[in-house]
């Protein structure tokens, strides 16, 4: 079957890294510089991706595979195949339309990317706040207030807990 197919379509013999050149009686020609073909039987080669500006070359383009980019330090990749580079912020911040802004009271971000998220509401799980939240860290929930009543357990009770989400600024 392969032999029959190749007799019908000489281009099917052209391997990756080449293209079937219609201008030269369908001879397999190597991809020109800065282009590639990742599969056989292609009639054109694709232009290599160029990593410019904040995009850095992670893998050079070859005749059979496209270049791959990542982001320069201070930026991180977004999208499939690192189609975008987004500026980092500090922990405790988020990137807004007006730049890196501190998380609002009651929210936190423990990464250099992404958005500020609300502190965990310990009381929803019937627990109390063991460690207060900050811009950079979520609250830590402790045992439920009932667990802290005298004689309820032999565990030493923690310091008196503040209201959920309370953080001294």
């Amino acid at each position: 079957f392969e032999r029959t197919r190749s007799l019908q379509d000489p281009c099917s013999n052209c391997p990756a890294g080449t293209f079937c050149d219609n201008n030269r009686n369908q001879i397999c020609s190597p991809c020109p510089p800065n282009s590639f073909s990742s599969a056989g039987g292609q009639r054109t080669c694709d232009i290599c991706r160029q990593c410019k500006g904040v995009f850095r070359t992670r893998k050079e383009c070859s005749s059979t595979s496209n270049a791959e980019c990542d982001c320069t330090p201070g930026f991180h990749c977004l999208g499939a195949g690192c189609s975008m580079c987004e500026q980092d912020c500090k922990q405790g911040q988020e990137l807004t339309k007006k730049g890196c802004k501190d998380c609002c009271f009651g929210t936190f971000n423990d990464q250099k990317r992404g958005i500020c998220r609300p502190w965990t509401n310990c009381s929803l799980d019937g627990k109390s706040v063991l460690v207060n939240g900050t811009k950079e860290r979520d609250v830590v929930c402790g045992p439920s207030p009932a667990d802290l009543s005298p004689g309820a357990s032999s565990v030493t009770p923690p310091a008196p807990a503040r209201e959920p989400g309370h953080s001294p600024q």
Partner: nanobody, 122 residues
Framework: EVQLVESGGGLVQPGGSLRLSCAAS????????MSWARQTPGKGFEWVSG???????YYTDSVKDRFTISRDNAKNTVYLQMNSLKPEDTAVYYC????????????????WGQGTQVTVSS
């Protein structure tokens, strides 16, 4: 072919001013958002400023009230007026298209100029 050519860089004393220009060709400039970035050996790349096609402007905090981005659609040129320059503004300044319209974000389809060196020193 898209081309962005920056000019106007140079050596300036602290407190001085410079006006960078970026001449654009090969695309519909008037409907394109544009941006400026800078690169320093120490800090790497930094998003500096952007301007939408409607003239809305955006700045990173460190240059607010000192730098002004503007555009002249008749000349296919975007400008960065830099006043009260500080030694920490020393960098290579790049002009780039800004297709994402998002602060601090560029896409792989954006185009970049070759950059112009700005040195602030006494």
């Amino acid at each position: 072919e898209v081309q962005l050519v920056e000019s106007g860089g140079g050596l300036v004393q602290p407190g001085g001013s410079l006006r960078l220009s970026c001449a654009a060709s090969g695309f519909t400039f008037s409907s394109s958002a544009m941006s400026w970035a800078r690169q320093t050996p120490g800090k790497g790349f930094e998003w500096v400023s952007g301007i939408y096609s409607d003239g809305s402007t955006y700045y990173t905090d460190s240059v607010k009230d000192r730098f002004t981005i503007s555009r002249d659609n008749a000349k296919n040129t975007v400008y960065l007026q830099m006043n009260s320059l500080k030694p920490e503004d020393t960098a290579v300044y790049y002009c780039a298209t800004w297709g994402t319209l998002r602060f601090g974000v560029w896409a792989e389809y954006d185009h970049w100029g070759q950059g112009t060196q700005v040195t602030v020193s006494s």
